[in-house]
């Protein structure tokens, strides 16, 4: 995903997970200067901003995801101990200082561990 100011690459657009797993939502970006990175969650239950930060500074994590999210300077985030309700669309927006933006989507499917799966 390329523009004059921002390029964004998402290696894995769909992630399948089971409950209690820690999940890395992996991205790579490049741009001029230090961008603002924002992750938003969208599902049938609604939409909310998860976190916003400039790499190298402290992240502003929403109350709903406090202690559940870890940010990385490459734009990726990790979700800890996911539940079924964490399934949905995770949208990253990278905005450079001059205002150029790119967005990309990762779809997360979280399922229960079925008893049969263990045997």
């Amino acid at each position: 995903l390329q523009s004059q100011g921002v390029s964004l690459y998402i290696p894995q657009a769909t992630i399948n997970a089971t409950v209690k797993e820690d999940i890395l939502l992996s991205v790579e970006y490049s741009c001029h200067g230090v961008p603002t990175i924002e992750w938003t969650y969208s599902s049938n239950w609604g939409t909310q901003k998860i976190v916003e930060w400039k790499p190298g500074t402290q992240a502003n994590i929403s109350q709903s995801h406090k202690d559940r999210v870890c940010t990385f300077d490459n734009g990726s985030i990790q979700l800890f101990s996911v539940g079924v309700r964490d399934s949905g669309y995770y949208v990253i927006t990278v905005t450079e200082r001059l205002g150029s933006s790119q967005f990309g989507t990762i779809v997360l499917h979280v399922s229960e561990i079925l008893y049969e799966d263990l045997h």
Epitope: Q2, L8, Q102, T105, V107
Partner: antibody, heavy 126, light 108 residues
Framework: QVQLVESGGGVVQPGRSRRLSCAAS????????MHWVRQAPGKGLEWVAF????????YYADSVTGRFTVSRDNSKNTLYLQINSLTTDDTAVFYC???????????????????WGQGSLVTVSS | EIVLTQSPGTLSLSPGERATLSCRAS???????LAWYQQKPGQAPRLLLY???NRATGIPDRFSGSGSGTDFTLTISRLEPEDFAVYYC?????????FGGGTKVEIK
């Protein structure tokens, strides 16, 4: 019914600027993201820009980043596209289109183009 | 950017026949973010399907969509005279949003 009417097209010299407008009616304009799409004569469709419902998020095609600016005035139910430094490659019919909620159920990110205007032709020629 | 390649470029069929149009993506697209449009000469495009398989309002059920990952298909089960047009696929899950080059369905 949903209606989108573009205006502002015409013949413009290379290097000059133009502002296109799209007047919206028949729906709650302020609740929807909006797109601009263009189509060069005899060619396919090219997405140009998107603006979210409150104008907080804007995305552009690579080919127009830095030259085109999308904006909106929700009090006037109008979408705008400012196009600068025009070249002959910009000759096209410009359509405005409403962004359906699609999969998001949410208007801060682009959805499918569920209603289109009739288009406004911009011809760049000296 | 995600490049969408449509095939064939032109499809010559008779009314009543089945039309199968292909759209291939350069990288995976989650099905929720793929749409199909129809455009007739001199007219604006019209949304047919979104989320790969959901018909837009007022679209007849002879239009259906399927596929996942990188391969998507639009099927018109029985062509009506008004279905002869150009069809575009489009993805809206990543910026920049992109269209395929189009498939023209013409009367044989």
């Amino acid at each position: 019914q949903v209606q989108l009417v573009e205006s502002g097209g015409g013949v413009v010299q290379p290097g000059r600027s133009r502002r296109l407008s799209c007047a919206a009616s028949g729906f709650a304009f302020r609740n929807y993201g909006m797109h601009w799409v263009r189509q060069a004569p005899g060619k396919g469709l090219e997405w140009v820009a998107f603006i979210s419902q409150n104008g907080g998020k804007k995305y552009y095609a690579d080919s127009v980043t830095g030259r085109f600016t999308v904006s909106r005035d929700n009090s006037k139910n109008t979408l705008y596209l400012q196009i600068n430094s025009l070249t002959t490659d910009d000759t096209a019919v410009f359509y405005c289109a409403r962004s359906g909620s699609g999969s998001w159920g949410y208007s801060d990110f682009p959805g499918p183009f569920d209603h289109w205007g009739q288009g406004s032709l911009v011809t760049v020629s000296s | 950017e995600i490049v969408l390649t449509q095939s064939p470029g032109t499809l010559s069929l008779s009314p009543g026949e089945r039309a199968t149009l292909s759209c291939r993506a350069s990288q995976n697209i989650f099905i929720s973010f793929l749409a199909w449009y129809q455009q007739k000469p001199g007219q604006a495009p019209r949304l047919l399907l979104y989320g790969a398989s959901n018909r837009a309002t007022g679209i007849p059920d002879r239009f259906s969509g399927s596929g996942s990952g990188t391969d998507f298909t639009l099927t018109i089960s029985r062509l009506e005279p008004e279905d002869f047009a150009v069809y575009y696929c489009q993805q809206y899950g990543s910026s920049p949003l992109t269209f395929g080059g189009g498939t023209k369905v013409e009367i044989k």
